[in-house]
């Protein structure tokens, strides 16, 4: 019967006793940077070309015996997971292997850098179709390795990497911490994070998504028909490399940003038990398990958005945190979050010709996060409209006044340490959804966008009594672009988007009285693109 991991990534409409997805990734070449491999294993023979690239350190220890089957173990298994005839994800994908890890599974930053350069040169000499580079390795944070990954990604190559097996923040490792790389954590058959001895999968904001990574059956270098079960984020990354190969084979023109958004969109949502992660990492870690799209075509009509968390600002009074979207993405809204609740809001600002989301810490605060909502919106023209503090009792307002521009997000930022928390909440006048409303002492920022066929609406959910969390979701066919809290609620820790749901977090109810200022209102801005929908219908 079908191995659990292949069943897990397969949408129900394709499920059968055998894993037979519609397209095997035949237009895509996957580069594997790993150990040596046993290329004559019948699972991968004829599918994997062993390049002459080898850059590995000497094995440690005088008593180390180099045994071929052991040297090839990791790479052979991963090649099988990506494109193996029997237990592979992308059965049609061809692979090229580069040896950057020695027989003990160790490599160097320099060896990996030279390997990436080898790929870049190969691409220039003989351009082929879409390229996926699988980096099933993790080392300490390396600015130079991350920069090399960025260069290759900007040349149109999709890089997929393991989050690492250290039960730690993936942002502390490379290439996992490189924003341009698709970073993959590992889950098991119960959709729980993988534990590996005393350690386990890495987590945090640098992880893009999770994928099967425990008891993964694949080619064993022991013999030509041998199979073995292996576990780790390398195996998880191999699944995503295979899924990416299949998506790119179906739609070869996909950009890295489009591919990443699709991987996120088609993932299984909210199935991971977050209690496994350290408490401070739960909100930052995506609750997503990779899956193949239900159809390899026809996703183009959707407005895709994802949430990008910044690094923590640190606790100093004037500390700020910045969240950025990828080059091909539009920043449609900006929000902030602080565990202590002491923050001075957030604003969208231009940096290097692109909008970024900046969150501000407050005096006595433990630090803030900026949260960007990054979307794929072709032909978009977005700008930020700001209203300074009004000082009037009605609060501060700003709206999108340009013809054809719609509101996609609201942010508010204040200079004062205390916003006058005992003021009653400001209510948005009915019939004026295209405006942002904020506290009278705050400056308000409206993200206003014009794009063909773009329409947006505001959806609110208010709870009169204090709650630790208030949510509001966009309905089917609409995509969440903006998430904020209505002003006047003193105990709000911040707002952020989780998939298509806007979450407003408040301080522990026990520390807040159930007085009128305990009311919390979550405000979601939901958008869709009629233009994208029409365009995809024309293509079919």
């Amino acid at each position: 019967s079908i191995p659990w991991n292949l069943e897990r990534i397969t949408p129900p409409r394709y499920r059968a006793d055998e894993y037979q997805p519609p397209d095997g990734g035949s237009l895509v070449e996957v580069y594997l940077l790993d150990t040596s491999i046993q290329s004559d294993h019948r699972e991968i023979e004829g599918r994997v070309m062993v390049t002459d690239f080898e850059n590995v350190p000497e094995e440690d220890g005088t008593r180390f015996h180099r045994q071929a089957s052991k040297c090839d173990s990791h790479g052979t298994h991963l090649a099988g997971v990506v494109s193996g005839r029997d237990a592979g994800v992308a059965k049609g994908a061809s692979m090229r292997s580069l040896r950057v890890l020695n027989c003990q599974g160790k490599g160097t930053v320099s060896g990996t850098l030279i390997g990436l350069e080898f790929i870049r040169k190969s691409q220039l000499v003989q351009p082929v179709g879409p390229l996926v580079v699988l980096l099933p390795l993790a080392g300490g944070y390396s600015r130079v390795l991350n920069a090399a990954c960025q260069r290759l990604a900007r040349a149109g190559v999709v890089l997929v990497t393991a989050a690492g097996n250290f039960r730690d923040d993936a942002c502390l490792y490379s290439p996992a911490s490189a924003p341009e790389v698709i970073t993959v954590g590992a889950t098991n058959a119960q959709d729980q994070p993988v534990t590996l001895g005393t350690l386990g999968t890495n987590f945090g904001r640098c992880v893009d998504l999770f994928a099967p990574g425990e008891d993964i059956i694949g080619a064993s270098s022991d013999c030509s028909t041998c199979f073995v079960s292996q576990s780790g984020t390398s195996q998880a990354a191999a699944h995503v490399a295979g899924i990416a190969a299949m998506m790119l084979s179906a739609e070869p023109e996909l950009t890295l940003a489009e591919l990443r958004q699709r991987l996120i969109h088609f993932s299984a949502k909210d199935v991971i038990n977050e209690a496994w992660f350290p408490e401070d990492q739960r909100v930052l870690t995506p609750n997503l398990v990779a899956a193949l799209p239900p159809s390899t075509h026809g996703a183009g009509w959707q407005l895709f958005c994802r949430t990008v968390w910044s690094a923590h600002s640190g606790p100093t009074r004037m500390a700020t945190a910045v969240a950025r979207c990828a080059p091909d993405e539009e920043l449609l809204s900006c929000s902030s979050f602080s565990r202590s609740g002491k923050r001075r809001g957030e604003r969208m600002e231009a940096q290097g010709g692109k909008l970024v989301c900046r969150a501000h810490n407050a005096f006595g605060g433990e630090g803030v996060y900026a949260i960007a909502r990054c979307c794929l919106l072709p032909q978009a023209n977005c700008s930020v409209h700001t209203a300074p503090p009004a000082e009037a009792s009605m609060g501060t307002r700003v709206h999108c006044h340009q013809q054809g521009h719609v509101l996609t997000g609201c942010s508010s930022h204040w200079e004062v340490e205390d916003l006058g928390t005992h003021k009653p909440p400001v209510l948005r006048p009915r019939g004026q959804p295209n405006q942002c409303v904020g506290h009278r002492e705050a400056s308000i920022h409206a993200s206003c966008c014009h794009a063909p066929g773009l329409e947006c609406k505001v959806k609110e959910h208010g709870i009169p009594a204090p709650q630790e969390q208030v949510t509001v979701a966009c309905e089917e066919g609409w995509t969440l672009t903006g998430c904020s809290a209505l002003p006047g609620t003193s105990h709000v820790l911040g707002a952020y988007a989780v998939d298509n749901t806007c979450v407003v977090r408040s301080r522990d109810v026990s520390t807040t009285g159930s007085t009128s200022e305990g009311a919390v209102t979550a405000v979601a801005i939901c958008c869709r693109s009629r233009h994208l929908a029409q365009a995809s219908q024309e293509l079919q």
Partner: antibody
Framework: QVQLVQSGAEVKKPGESLKISCKGS????????ISWVRQMPGKGLEWMGM????????SYNPKFQGQVTISADKSISTAYLQWSSLKASDTAMYYC????????????WGQGTLVTVSS | DIVMTQSPDSLAVSLGERATINCRSS????????????LAWYQQKPGQPPKLLIY???TRESGVPDRFSGSGSGTDFTLTISSLQAEDVAVYYC?????????FGQGTKVEIK
Amino acid sequence: QVQLVQSGAEVKKPGESLKISCKGSGYSFTNYYISWVRQMPGKGLEWMGMIYPGDSYTSYNPKFQGQVTISADKSISTAYLQWSSLKASDTAMYYCARDHWSKPYFDIWGQGTLVTVSS
Amino acid sequence: DIVMTQSPDSLAVSLGERATINCRSSQSVLYSSNNKNYLAWYQQKPGQPPKLLIYWASTRESGVPDRFSGSGSGTDFTLTISSLQAEDVAVYYCQQYSSFPITFGQGTKVEIK
């Protein structure tokens, strides 16, 4: 039920070409390997080679490489063994058998095709 | 290539008696990754194709009578018929399926004494 059905016996002259077949049914043909095994009169079993119908990957016993060609047509769940120029020494019973990555032994065999090459 | 050698070439046993066939491989077919021996036993009766009896050296195929058992590990293996029946008259082959080319033993003919 799961079965492999082979084409009928053949009598040929040396130098002639021949293609014998093995049709799979009752299972997912593209997800199993098909091997061909030779048994010369009164002798033992010799593995000739195999094919994976899913992508037509083949692997041959060096002893038979270049002597025979293994192919498959997955649309009709059929594997083939062919000779371009038969020799008297090709006289034998030929069996097809299937195996799977999780069961790499031959669990199902065809009934055999007797090939006689004589002038 | 892995060479498979069976002994004896032929064997005559009385009905109800034990028949033992040995098979030796020129290199180990036991693999540490899954701790399995990549060895099978087949039975071939006159005019019929071979039939799978035992796989992974000791696992009986479904439908095979429990008088057939396989044992051994690494390079030395044994097929035992605990109580020979008339219908067990056949040629028995061992086979390694770990590396290519796949190879069979030369066969052992079992007859009734």
